[in-house]
């Protein structure tokens, strides 16, 4: 069965500068399968961000802003990167990477 | 010192158009959320829109959509409300106000630096 | 929409009194709610944020309380300054909607 680990506990950044979110995933190969990505907030409910599929598909929530995040895949390190452009105060938040194994 | 200074207010023929200007000074603009609040004569506080720092995220009262735009000039120090088809019910002083911005409590907003605002009538 | 009612909408009130005022959400927003004084012919003034968190120079007659649906603003000992309205404000997320006001007067 896979595994993910996000090895950044905690990520720091300067507003308006890019914060690049780690999800290692192992058991598995990331080729077989959907990463998603979910942030929250206190007291708020989890939201679903975006995904990206087997196939290189990627999937994005209708609500968010365009631009502000991308998602990748690299085989060769079994990670999915979640980009997030110009950080402001609305993305201080915790970030969930999930699986789905097809 | 910080401050907002709005411009642009007037009066207006019903469904006509409007364009707030909102000066900010004393602080770096462009690590704030702006937002535009409104009261009507003897009326209480309405929220209006709100902006974030690189403007990903915009917001509108439900009753605005598709008639008022927010925008900002970060290079300007500036903010913008730009309001078309105007009607009798938008007459209001329009206030700029700035988020309290990002500290130890970042999670938490609230409207900490409002300017003095701008008159806008509609009325035939 | 999540509506914001304040209660009363009016109070009369002595210097040195002790008042509260409530504000009610129509469904839970944890503790995003800040609290707004505005005097005739003046702009608001941030008094609480996060439910009850002082802002910085409010006097600390003022406090804040709650979370969810049920919040309150006290003010412990009336002082002249303070006949005046009071809004709070919700923003867990938009519309960040005010409450139609409280109006404090002397009694």
């Known amino acids: 069965a896979g595994h993910l680990e996000q090895p950044q506990i905690s990520s720091t950044k300067t507003l308006s500068k890019t914060a690049r979110l780690e999800c290692v995933v192992s058991g598995i190969t990331i080729s077989a399968t959907s990463v998603y990505w979910y942030r929250e907030r206190p007291g708020e409910v989890i939201q679903f961000l975006v995904s990206i599929s087997y196939d290189g598909t990627v999937r994005k929530e209708s609500g968010i802003p365009s631009g502000k995040f991308e998602v990748d895949r690299i085989p060769e390190t079994s990670t999915s990167t979640l980009t997030i452009h110009n950080v402001e105060k609305q993305d201080i938040a915790t970030y969930y990477c999930a699986l789905w194994e097809v | 010192e910080v401050q907002l200074l709005e411009s642009g207010g007037g009066l207006v023929k019903p469904g006509g158009s409007l364009r707030l200007s909102c000066a900010a000074s004393?602080?770096?603009?462009?690590?704030?959320?702006m937002n535009w609040v409104r009261q009507a004569p003897r009326k209480g506080l309405e929220w209006v829109s709100s902006?974030?720092?690189?403007?990903?995220?915009?917001y509108y009262a439900d009753s605005l959509k598709g008639r008022f735009t927010i925008s900002r000039d970060n290079a300007k120090n500036s903010l913008f409300l730009q309001m078309n088809s105007l009607r009798a019910e938008d007459t209001a002083v329009y206030y700029c106000?700035?988020?309290?911005?990002?500290?130890?409590?970042?999670?938490?907003?609230?409207?900490?630096?409002w300017g003095q605002g701008t008159m806008v009538t509609v009325s035939s | 929409d999540i509506v914001m009612t304040q209660s009363p909408s009016s109070l009369s009130a002595s210097v040195g009194d002790r008042v509260t005022i409530t504000c009610r959400a129509s469904q839970g927003i944890y503790n995003y709610l800040a609290w707004y004084q505005q005097k005739p012919g003046n702009v608001p003034k941030l008094l609480i944020y996060?439910?009850?968190t002082l802002q910085s120079g409010v006097p600390s007659r003022f406090s804040g309380s709650g979370s969810g649906t049920d919040f309150s603003l006290t003010i412990s000992s009336l002082q002249p300054e303070d006949f005046t309205t009071y809004y709070c404000q919700k923003y867990n997320r938009a519309p960040f909607t005010f409450g139609p006001g409280t109006k404090v007067d002397i009694k």
């Open positions: 004393g602080f770096s603009f462009s690590n704030y959320d």
């Open positions: 106000a700035r988020d309290r911005g990002v500290t130890t409590d970042y999670y938490y907003y609230a409207l900490d630096v």
């Open positions: 996060a439910a009850s």
């Open positions: 902006i974030s720092s690189s403007s990903h995220y915009i």
